[in-house]
Amino acid sequence: TPEVWVQVQMEATELSSFTVHCGFLGPGSISLVTVSWGGPDGAGGTKLAVLHPELGTRQWAPARQARWETQSSISLALEDSGASSPFANTTFCCKFASFPEGSWESCGSLPPSSDPGLSAPPTPVPILRAD
């Protein structure tokens, strides 16, 4: 069964910077990746970035840079402009669409006791959809 993993990392040098890493474990080619925060895409979450292997990427604040790391993984850099760190308590979700197989989504967040520079362990919580 395909699986999606999500890691949320706080940068050691800039405590206001976070990076979300997501990857797809499974067969098939990825046709679209959507990163959202506050919940799954389409279920109360807000799209932060959309990455398409051919059409390119779109991102919205507070996302700073979305990019492909491999053919099946992406990273999204976030800039926290506020004095506090709302990202620390936020859920980030990544949805990988593999056409025509369907889409798989998983969510993760920064562990409360995370040290800067350390990433959260992969926490796949698959949300299977038959899109």
Epitope: S31, L32, G38, G39, D41, G42, G44, G45, T46, K47, V50, H52, L55, G56, R58, W60, A97, F99, P100, S103, D131
Partner: nanobody
Framework: HVQLVESGGGLVQPGGSLRLSCVAS??????????MAWFRQAPGKGLEAVAG???????TYADSVKGRFTASRDNAGFSLYLQMNSLRAEDTAVYYC???????????????????WGQGTMVTVSS
């Protein structure tokens, strides 16, 4: 809950211009649809696809409006616009905004998979 609200309709003379707007709003989150599109329904006629634009900026137009109408979206991704130039009497219709998501981020064949619809705004082209 997602709501689409259109504005900008009105009465215009043949050859004139109008700009329609549509804003997608949701309770509790910002909704950025993969695809946003315009449809229209002329008096006594069926629903007709006019234009669609995906989240990457790719556009699709009905043959009847190509070269006259231009669809665009704002940078935030949740507003849709339709610039209508060289309007004709046959453009008279109620114009509806529609939005939805698709497996690959593009607009599906217009009319398919768009699960949110606005209430419509009336455009009348008459001298």
């Amino acid at each position: 809950h997602v709501q689409l609200v259109e504005s900008g309709g009105g009465l215009v003379q043949p050859g004139g211009s109008l700009r329609l707007s549509c804003v997608a709003s949701a309770s509790g989150f910002t909704y950025r649809p993969y695809c946003m599109a315009w449809f229209r329904q002329a008096p006594g006629k069926g629903l007709e696809a006019v234009a669609g634009i995906d989240i990457f900026g790719g556009t699709t137009y009905a043959d009847s409006v190509k070269g006259r109408f231009t669809a665009s979206r704002d940078n935030a991704g949740f507003s849709l616009y339709l610039q209508m130039n060289s309007l004709r009497a046959e453009d008279t219709a109620v114009y509806y905004c529609a939005a939805g998501d698709s497996p690959d981020g593009r607009c599906p064949p217009l009319g398919q998979g768009l699960n949110y619809w606005g209430q419509g705004t009336m455009v009348t082209v008459s001298s």
